[in-house]
Structure formats: structure tokens, C-alpha cells
Amino acid sequence: FKVATPYSLYVCPEGQNVTLTCRLLGPVDKGHDVTFYKTWYRSSRGEVQTCSERRPIRNLTFQDLHLHHGGHQAANTSHDLAQRHGLESASDHHGNFSITMRNLTLLDSGLYCCLVVEIRHHHSEHRVHGAMELQVQTGKDAPSNCVVYPSSSQDSENITAA
């Protein structure tokens, strides 16, 4: 499987909510000996590899925000901790995987990464990630609602296998 990022850039006004999305592509094993771990974190555009560094999102670590389930099952964070920080990550039956951030501030601007790991009994992890930029704007130049910019066809096909 691979991970696609439908949008590479989200430009939002301060105070707005946004949902960042990744999509799982390709065959997904639904066997009993496989588990999927999905999470979100902030990172920086490394010279060598984007998404290597794992920084917290609003003080919540990648472990605080992770989902853990089999196959294409639906899941979402029910953690009070995440919701108290205005965050919720979710995964549906169709391979879509998202994080919703409420009441955006300028401090939320930056690079966001989704990570999906297939964990299988007796096998090494299969790790894939996607990256997207969030720009939170204020003042007269800010849009009234979030504007999303699709990934180029090259980006969405040149999908990162970590």
C-alpha cells in the first residue's frame, strides 16, 4: 500500500477549523495477523527526508494522536486529551485518514505529516507517510474560509514510502 496526500497546501484564516487528509492506496491486508497504526505529527522539511522529525501538534505527541486497528476498519480518537486541545484524528472504511484542528491560530502553521504503519506478526514494519503544509493567515489578506491546493499529479503519484 501507499499513502497519497490529496492536498499539499491548506491556507486558512485564524479561528477556522481545518481537516488535513491522507489516503491509503492499494491493497490493504485485512488478516488477523495484521494491525494498522496511523498517526499525525508536525515536522520540518529535512534536506534528506521530509517527516523524519516528529514534533508534537499542540503539545500532543504522535503517540497521543495515534489510531490502532485492523484492515479498512473505521476508527477515531476518543481521547479527551486530544479533544481538549481541539484535535481529532479519524479513519474511515475507504482508506481516508484525517486530523481535524479546531480554532486555528498562527502557531498552527507548519508542515504536518501522516504516518501509516502496517504491523504484521514476525515481519518488519511497512511504513509510509505523507506531508502537507498548513498556513494560517490573519488580517485583510486572509481568506474567509480555508483554501486547499491539490497535490500535483507528480506529487500524488510520487508517493512516499518511508
Epitope: D33, T35, Y37, T39, G46, V48, Q49, S52, E53, R54, F62, Q63, H66, H68, L115, V117, I119, R120, H121, H122, H123, S124, E125, R127, A162
Partner: antibody, heavy 119, light 107 residues
Framework: QLQLQESGPGLVKPSETLSLTCTVS??????????WGWIRQPPGKGLEWIGS???????YYNPSLKSRVTISVDTSKNQCSLKLNSVTTADTAVYYC???????????WGQGTLVTVSS | DIQMTQSPSSLSASVGDRVTITCRAS??????LAWYQQKPEKAPKSLIY???SLQSGVPSRFSGSGSGTDFTLTISSLQPEDFATYYC?????????FGQGTKLEIK
Amino acid sequence: QLQLQESGPGLVKPSETLSLTCTVSGGSISSSGYYWGWIRQPPGKGLEWIGSLYSSGYTYYNPSLKSRVTISVDTSKNQCSLKLNSVTTADTAVYYCARHPVAMNFDDWGQGTLVTVSS
Amino acid sequence: DIQMTQSPSSLSASVGDRVTITCRASQGISSWLAWYQQKPEKAPKSLIYAASSLQSGVPSRFSGSGSGTDFTLTISSLQPEDFATYYCQQYNSYPYTFGQGTKLEIK
């Protein structure tokens, strides 16, 4: 603050089974998204990964030891156990338990316990 | 198995020196490399993950770089507490493997 504490006999006879326990405090051993691993270090030598157990029960062993090793978890006691059978003097080492999150390295370690294999 | 080879195996340096330790993987491991510091009679401590990311609480004089097969750990200005043994570890695939270690001693 997560703490890991290894315990078990410090002396084991050749051909017998080495049994160690790692007791976890300050966190749940059944928390999803973590592996619980064992690493050993013979006196004056380097580190060797023995194996790891994922929170959902999946196990991963070093092929060099796979035929002799078993890692298991007791969630009721918040403990992870290592069993290594048919030991020889080459198994004399400091044994560490450690935790690593998914797709990450070992970020929390116990202080280690020395096990000597001798008759 | 992926073999990890560190060099040098030992190194003498003085407080204030800049020190570099290298680690080479026998096959590509992307950025799935960690560096640890170990002091006598103590457990290893994680310094760097993902080849170049600093573990929380680790002083900024430590830095890592590299990708694929060649990696380096750099200490920009040695402090007295930095004299220890350093290990690299790949966590790209099982079995996880460590370098043989580099012992950093006071000159």
C-alpha cells in the same frame, strides 16, 4: 515517568533456562503503539537485540536466537518476560528491557541485570 | 541481516573539541538510524533518532546526519560528561542491529 525494572536470577547453569522479568511502572504495558524489547550486552562488548513484543501480542526475534527465545507479556502484572533456554557461557551478559514506539528506536531502558552462566 | 560498522572503534579527544563518529550500514536503511550514548554500568541513552532528529532533552551540541548507508554523529564542543561509548542502531528492518561501538576517551 515510565520506569522499567529487570529482575531474575543472576546465576544460571549451562543447559538450563534463563528467565527474566521486566516490570513496568508509570505506564501500561498494554498501551497500543509500543513494543517491549530485550537487548543484551556481554561484558566489555556491544549491544545485541534479542527480540521485541508488540502491544497486540505479535513477536519478533533475532534469527540467531529464535530457536531458544520466548518473549511474553502479563498485562495483569504489567510485566514482560524473557525466556532463553539451553544457555551456554556465551549467554553471560547484562540483559536490558526497553520500550520502542512504532517506527521508532528504543527510547526508554531499564537499568539492566547481569546474568552469569556458569556451573 | 544488516551489518552496522562504526569508525573509529576508539577516539581520544579533549574538552572543547569537535568530534565526528561514522556509521555505515551494509545496505540502505533510509533514515531509520539512531545513536545512543552509554556510560559505564549504565543503560544506553537515546540521543538521535531518524538519523538527524534530536531526542527530547538532549543538548544541541549533538547532531546527526546521513541517509541510506552512511551516517555521522557530531559533538560540536566536547563536554566532560560526553566521554562515553556511542552506538548506532538501525531500525529499518528486523533483526535490529547495532554498531560495535565507539569509545570516546579523554586525551
